[in-house]
Interface confidence: medium
């Protein structure tokens, strides 16, 4: 019955292609393990692994955890996509102050150009508002109301922009939940700097050092500190945790200020997909008869590249605790080896890097 | 026109073996994925293993794994799967069945019962 | 059991329309292509549906298929007695393949 997807008539000598006559062409077929990524891949790279949801493959081919824009002051810039991760931007009126990866540790309020001063540069997601000296021949009353907005009378904005952290709630760090007539609240109890008279409301020259925690003069223990769910990672920039939150994983590692949170599988499953701090694919733990046990075979045996087993299939079976419950998972790291031995006569080997998908095909990960 | 033809099945003790065979013919056999899925007796549908064209990987069930092994001849255009250590739930009627290129089951054998029985 | 969750059985009569579910998760049904199969008395299955919606030819149009997040749905109408049989749903992955419980459709 299926005589609209015949494969055979004109790639006949190459088993590696076939014949798709809803595009009267040869398509190059996927190596077993590997999914096309559009109808009629013509070469490797057009198959690939794919990652659980709300994971990304990145450039290491290891499925990454995307970050997560649940923050009140964060909006979704970029979604989540096979190969990059979710970006997060600060939301309207507010720029980032601290930087992280793909997303912004720390943002703040639009700061209000002051009486006498207007707008140079509107703020953005990214950088604050700048202003200049009025005109001469500017009004008071502005040409403009997008060139001059003017704080409530008897306040004077600052240099220094109100952040919104949901880890503190004094008045001068307040919630963003109240909307935009908050946010102009908070901008308009600003005063100004007196050193900076051309850019209200530039930030500090560090704005990542947290306000609760001074650097004294002279102390070398003076470090950034992230939001909450952030990290310090090794370049020094604020990085997003990875979220335990999918059933099948728990925490195993807090997120500390300099490492992230890792997460491991639930107990009675196993990592079969790895992915950074994380299971990108956990599968229930073989319970196996003594006779069943095998021994994973030597690795250097084998001559392709080792992939985890899909959902659906397991490790080599070890037995089960004397106390008939089966194992906790390994570490996030540690993933299981497909029994699969690809020959030499494969075209790639299972885990090349590979091409975007023009049909947005869901494929499925190799590991 | 595309056919598949299982045979091997029969009686046969627990912690005993069996070889099933699938005879393809039909289509270019070497440039196909195949696969074996059983279905025991007023049961579902099971997936058992699978294998790539060409001398490609080789991926089980969990429930099978360590126990059966699939493999393939082009030249004779035949898919195997030796069974070993058969367990009373191996039970069922076994299908050869070929992957389209994006691993739905195009066409199936009409299948090979196994009893695995004392 | 299956992780791919199916109602047990369906009915209609002829000339109704009936819809069977697939019940899955993000890890199956939520990030794969769904497929469906039909199982007629006493023989193996026939693919009837692949791609989450896609008609092999041969295939009737009363037979669609439609997926929403994590489930999936096969939707007859028009039924007919020739159409009392067992349908499969079927999750597809490189590396194994997940097929719902069944359901046995009756036609009344």
């Known amino acids: 019955f299926p005589q609209d997807r015949p494969f055979e008539d004109t790639c006949h000598g190459n088993p590696s292609h076939y014949y798709d006559k809803a595009v009267r062409r040869c398509c190059y077929r996927c190596p077993m393990g590997l999914f096309p990524t559009q109808q009629c891949p013509q070469r490797p790279t057009d198959c690939r692994k794919q990652c659980e949801p709300d994971y990304y493959l990145d450039e290491a081919d290891r499925c990454t955890a995307c970050v997560t824009c649940s923050r009140d002051d964060l909006v979704e810039k970029t979604p989540c996509a096979w190969n990059s991760s979710r970006v997060c931007e600060c939301r309207p009126g507010m720029f980032c102050s601290t930087s992280a990866v793909n997303s912004c540790a720390r943002c703040f309020f639009h700061s209000v150009c002051p009486a006498g001063m207007i707008v140079k540069f509107p703020g953005t997601a990214q950088k604050n508002t700048v202003c200049e000296p009025a005109s001469p021949g500017v009004s008071p009353a502005c040409a403009s109301p997008e060139n001059c907005k003017e704080p409530s009378s008897g306040t004077i904005p600052q240099a220094k922009p109100t952040p919104v952290s949901p880890a503190t709630s004094s008045a001068s760090t307040m919630p963003v939940r109240g909307g935009t007539r908050l946010a102009q609240e908070a901008a308009s109890k600003l005063t100004r700097a007196p050193d900076s008279p051309s850019s209200v409301g530039r930030p500090s020259s560090d704005p990542g050092l947290s306000p609760t925690q001074p650097c004294p003069e002279g102390s070398g223990d003076c470090r950034k500190q992230c939001e909450p769910d952030y990290y310090l990672d090794e370049a020094g920039r604020c990085t997003a945790c990875v979220s335990c939150s999918r059933d099948d994983l728990v925490e195993k590692t807090p997120c500390a200020w300099n490492s992230s949170r890792t997460c491991e599988c639930r107990p009675g499953m196993i990592c079969a997909t790895s992915a950074t701090n994380s299971c990108a694919r956990c599968v229930p733990y073989p319970i196996c008869a003594a006779e069943t046990v095998t021994k994973p075979q030597d690795m250097a045996e084998k001559d392709t590249t080792f992939e985890a087993p899909p959902l659906g299939t397991q490790p080599d079976c070890n037995p089960t605790p004397e106390n008939g419950e089966a194992p906790a998972s390994t570490s996030p790291t540690q993933s299981l080896l497909v029994d699969s031995q690809a020959s030499k006569t494969l075209p790639i080997p299972t885990s090349a890097p590979v091409a975007l998908s023009s049909t947005g095909k869901p494929v499925l990960d190799a590991g | 026109e595309v056919q598949l033809l299982e045979s091997g099945g029969g009686l046969v003790q627990p912690g005993g073996s069996l070889r099933l065979s699938c005879a393809a013919s039909g289509f270019t056999f070497s440039s196909y994925h195949m696969s074996w899925v059983r279905q025991a007796p007023g049961k579902g549908l099971e997936w058992v293993s699978g294998i790539g064209y060409g001398h490609g990987g080789t991926y089980y069930a969990d429930s099978v794994k360590g126990r059966f092994t699939i493999s393939r001849d082009n030249s004779k255009n035949t898919l195997y799967l030796q069974m070993n250590s058969l367990r009373a739930e191996d039970t069922a009627v076994y299908y050869c069945a070929r992957y389209d290129y994006d691993y739905s089951f195009d066409y199936w054998g009409q299948g090979t019962l196994v009893t695995v029985s004392s | 059991q299956s992780v791919l969750t199916q109602p047990p059985s369906a009915s209609g009569t002829p000339g109704q329309r009936v819809t069977i579910s697939c019940s899955g998760s993000s890890s199956n049904i939520g990030s794969n292509y769904v497929y469906w199969y039909q199982q007629l008395p006493g023989t193996a299955p026939k693919l009837l549906i692949y791609r989450n919606n896609q008609r092999p030819s041969g295939v009737p149009d009363r037979f669609s298929g439609s997926k929403s997040g994590t489930s999936a749905s096969l939707a007859i109408s028009g039924l007919r007695s020739e159409d009392e049989a067992d349908y499969y749903c079927?999750?597809?992955?490189?590396?194994?393949?997940?097929f719902g419980g069944g359901t046995k459709l009756t036609v009344l």
């Open positions: 079927a999750v597809s992955s490189p590396y194994s393949y997940v």
